[in-house]
C-alpha cells in the first residue's frame, strides 16, 4: 500500500528574467527513493538518479540547475515557462509518487509565492 505523500511548493509565481526553486518532499513512507524525475508537461527537464547523480536534459542545460536537495532551480525565466511542472519519485517498494507545481511567470514585479499544499 502506498502511504506516502508529496508536499510541493504549490502554485508559485516569479518575475520574468528571475529564477525560482521547484521543490517536492516525499514523506510518510519508508520507501526508498531510487530516482526523481522533473518534467514540464511532457518534457523531461532533469533526473536525479541514485547511482548516476544528476542529469539535465541538453535543451535545458543553460537554464536549469540541480538542487537544492532533490529540487530544481529554473533560471532566466520567460513567460513561456508558465505552466505545470511535475516531480516524479520512483521508490522501492511503493512505486511512483507524483507531485504537481504550477508556475506563473509574470512581466511585472508583483510576483509572490503561493501557499504550500499536499498531494496524497
Amino acid at each position: 500500500m502506498m502511504t506516502g505523500t508529496i508536499e510541493t511548493t504549490g502554485n508559485i509565481s516569479a518575475e520574468k528574467g528571475g529564477s525560482i526553486i521547484l521543490q517536492c518532499h516525499l514523506s510518510s513512507t519508508t520507501a526508498q527513493v531510487t530516482q526523481v524525475n522533473w518534467e514540464q508537461q511532457d518534457q523531461l527537464l532533469a533526473i536525479c538518479n541514485a547511482d548516476l547523480g544528476w542529469h539535465i536534459s541538453p535543451s535545458f542545460k543553460d537554464r536549469v540547475a540541480p538542487g537544492p536537495g532533490l529540487g530544481l532551480t529554473l533560471q532566466s525565466l520567460t513567460v513561456n515557462d508558465t505552466g505545470e511542472y511535475f516531480c516524479i519519485y520512483h521508490t522501492y517498494p511503493d512505486g511512483t509518487y507524483t507531485g504537481r507545481i504550477f508556475l506563473e511567470v509574470l512581466e511585472s514585479s508583483v510576483a509572490e509565492h503561493g501557499a504550500r499544499f499536499q498531494i496524497p
Epitope: E7, S27, Q32, N49, A50, D51, P68, G69, L70
Partner: antibody, heavy 119, light 113 residues
C-alpha cells in the same frame, strides 16, 4: 576536508535523557542526508536515526522509536540526537554519519561520542 | 528486518596473502529497476571510526586501494583483499541499505600473522 565532530556523551542513569550534537564542516551540510549509528560494547553497529537534507523526513528503527529524536540546524551545520527513557542497552559509541542524496550508505563518519547508561 | 551474516568472524593471514570474507543477507538486496545491489562494505581500524570501502556491492570508494574488491549479487556478497598489507588490520562490516531499518553484519576481524 569533511569533518564530523560529535559531542555530548556521558554517564546517564537508566530512564534519563541526553542530547548529542554533531558539528559538520568542510561540505555543504544542507545538501546531505544524515544519520546516527551506534556501536555497542560488543562492537556491533546499529543504525539508530535518519534525517533528510532539509529535515522534513525522519526515520528510526523500532528499538529507539518514541525515545530518540533526530533533528538538524542547517544554519548552524549541526545535527542532534535527543535521547530519553534511556536503557542500559543504549550504552554505545554514537557516530554521526553523512549520506549522499538517494544513496543510503554512510560515506563519512565522525569520531564518535560515548554514552554509558548505568545506575 | 534484513539480517546480515558475516563469515568468518575472524581470520589471521600473512602479509601478501589473498583474503576473502563473505556477507549473506536474509533477503535479496538487488533492486530490479536499476539492477543495483544495495550493499556497502566498511573498514574499521583499531581506535578509529568506520570508513566506507565499497558501495553498490562492487563500486570502490574514491581513494580506496584497488586491492579491495567487492563482488556478489542478491543475497551473497564477498569482499576480497588481493594482497594483504599490515595496515589492513581491521574489522570489516557489510551493511544493507536496501530497506529500513538499515542493518549491519557482525563484522569480520582481520588479524595479521
Amino acid at each position: 576536508e569533511v569533518q564530523l565532530v560529535e559531542s555530548g556523551g556521558g554517564l546517564v542513569k537508566p530512564g534519563g535523557s541526553l542530547k548529542l550534537s554533531c558539528a559538520a564542516s568542510g561540505f555543504a551540510f544542507s545538501d546531505y542526508d544524515m544519520s546516527w549509528v551506534r556501536q555497542t560494547p560488543e562492537k556491533r553497529l546499529e543504525w539508530v536515526a535518519y534525517i533528510s537534507d532539509g529535515g522534513y523526513n525522519t526515520y528510526y528503527p523500532d528499538t529507539v522509536k518514541g525515545r530518540f529524536t533526530i533533528s538538524r540546524d542547517n544554519a548552524k551545520n549541526t545535527l542532534y540526537l535527543q535521547m530519553s527513557s534511556l536503557k542500559s542497552e543504549d550504552t554505545a559509541i554514537y557516530y554521526c554519519a553523512r549520506q549522499i542524496l538517494l544513496r543510503y550508505y554512510f560515506d563519512y563518519w565522525g569520531q564518535g561520542t560515548t554514552l554509558t547508561v548505568s545506575s | 528486518d534484513i539480517v546480515m551474516s558475516q563469515s568468518p568472524s575472524s581470520l589471521a593471514v600473512s602479509v601478501g596473502e589473498k583474503v576473502t570474507m563473505t556477507c549473506k543477507s536474509s533477503q535479496s538486496l538487488l533492486y530490479s529497476s536499476n539492477q543495483k545491489n544495495y550493499l556497502a562494505w566498511y573498514q574499521q581500524k583499531p581506535g578509529q571510526s568506520p570508513k566506507l570501502l565499497i558501495y553498490w556491492a562492487s563500486t570502490r570508494e574514491s581513494g580506496v586501494p584497488d586491492r579491495f574488491t567487492g563482488s556478489g549479487s542478491g543475497t551473497d556478497f564477498t569482499l576480497t583483499i588481493s594482497s594483504v598489507k599490515a595496515e589492513d588490520l581491521a574489522v570489516y562490516y557489510c551493511q544493507q541499505y536496501h530497506s529500513y531499518p538499515w542493518t549491519f553484519g557482525g563484522g569480520t576481524k582481520l588479524e595479521i600473522k
